[in-house]
């Protein structure tokens, strides 16, 4: 495998890790997609200092990250523990909410415009952020 | 100059297989998803797959799902396409393509033809 | 999948000619399109990304609008060079797809 150790053109660089913020939107796992195809992922929020960084980066926009719990519980994308770990939701949230009327509930964390988070109808186009660290080894998967 | 340069393609018997190869010079492989886009005789693009810089990531269009694998060796600036149990459907001049996560094929190679036929 | 639906699939015109071709995608896309030109026996080349961003060294008279699920090629003023097959192609989602194409020739 290589090891990234700088950031990719566009990308910020901040304490060992890269951040790509989207200006378009689109659904969260066509965003998912496109971090993976990025050799990255949604971001993952795991300290009020990353969230603090984030939240400067995006503005008053919403904004997806890297949690779901569209298979039952909370998961981050990268296995980050959900329970122990950092979390900002608003009050009364995540309400997993049907009234929107469009099916289902509500199964993917968003950034709102004050920073805290919402669960939200993963179809919804919003802007997201990618997120890959750096020094980590990329793993190359052996030819068949 | 970019520079990608397909080859192994040919006639094959239908379920049978074959490897497609795609050579590449003149940018910074290993960072660069790339893809693969067909196109039949007469018809219009279908793009097939797409792989990630690492490798790490890879997508497919429904119809070769199971049966297609993209991979690359970035050591060697190359990309792969597998394909098994070929159909008459699969025929088609294969691209390969230097892509990005925005899906933007910004250059291409010059093709080859796959013929899968009795 | 998303399809995307070329109109018209053929135009004849003359150079000097402004040439409109239309894309619609079955379900919103923002502007997550790309316009290619293929010549015949040669592989496409990227002219327009995201909506209406025109790739380097296209030429001005190339200009790419729309949004959501309704977008437009347009060739201001038609040059021999021009004449080819225009195809658009959605990035908003697995599968990747393009539209059945529109063939610009010479009347």
């Known amino acids: 495998g290589s090891e990234r150790t700088c950031c990719p053109v566009n990308w910020v660089e901040h304490e060992r890790s890269c951040y790509w913020f989207s200006r378009s939107g689109k659904a969260w796992a066509d965003a998912d997609n496109y971090c993976r195809l990025e050799d990255a992922h949604l971001v993952v929020v795991t300290s009020w200092e990353e969230q603090k960084f984030v939240q400067h980066h995006i503005g008053p926009v919403n904004t997806w990250m890297g949690l779901h719990d569209q298979n039952g519980p909370w998961k981050w994308v990268d296995g980050t523990d959900y329970e122990t770990g950092f979390k900002n939701w608003r009050p009364e949230q995540p309400d997993d909410w049907y009234g929107h009327g469009l099916g289902g509930g509500e199964d993917c964390a968003h950034f709102t415009d004050d920073g805290r988070w919402n669960d939200d109808v993963c179809q919804r186009p919003y802007r997201w952020v990618c997120e890959t660290e750096l020094d980590k080894a990329s793993q190359e998967p052996p030819l068949l | 100059e970019v520079q990608l340069l397909e080859s192994g393609g040919g006639l094959v018997q239908p379920g049978g297989s074959l490897r497609l190869s795609c050579a590449a010079s003149g940018f910074t492989f290993r960072s660069s998803a790339m893809s693969w886009v067909r196109q039949a005789p007469g018809k219009g693009l279908e793009w097939v797959s797409v792989?990630?810089?690492?490798?790490?990531?890879?997508f497919y269009t429904d119809s070769v799902k199971g049966r297609f694998t993209i991979s690359r060796d970035n050591s060697k600036n190359t990309l792969y396409l597998q394909m098994n149990s070929l159909r008459a459907e699969d025929t088609a001049v294969y691209y390969c393509a230097k892509s990005n996560s925005s899906g933007w094929f910004d250059y291409w190679g010059q093709g080859t033809l796959v013929t899968v036929s009795s | 999948a998303i399809q995307m639906t070329q109109s018209p699939s053929s135009v004849s015109a003359s150079v000097g000619d402004r040439v409109t071709i239309t894309c619609r995608a079955s379900?919103?896309?923002?502007?997550?399109l790309a316009w290619y030109q293929q010549k015949p026996g040669k592989a496409p080349n990227l002219m327009i990304h995201a909506a209406f961003s025109l790739q380097g060294g296209v030429p001005s008279r190339f200009s790419g609008s729309g949004s959501g699920t309704d977008f437009t090629l347009t060739i201001s003023s038609l040059q021999p060079e021009d004449f080819a097959t225009y195809y658009c192609q959605q990035t908003n989602s697995f599968p990747w797809t393009f539209g059945q194409g529109t063939k610009v020739e010479i009347k």
């Open positions: 379900q919103g896309i923002s502007n997550w």
């Open positions: 792989i990630s810089g690492s490798g790490g990531s890879t």
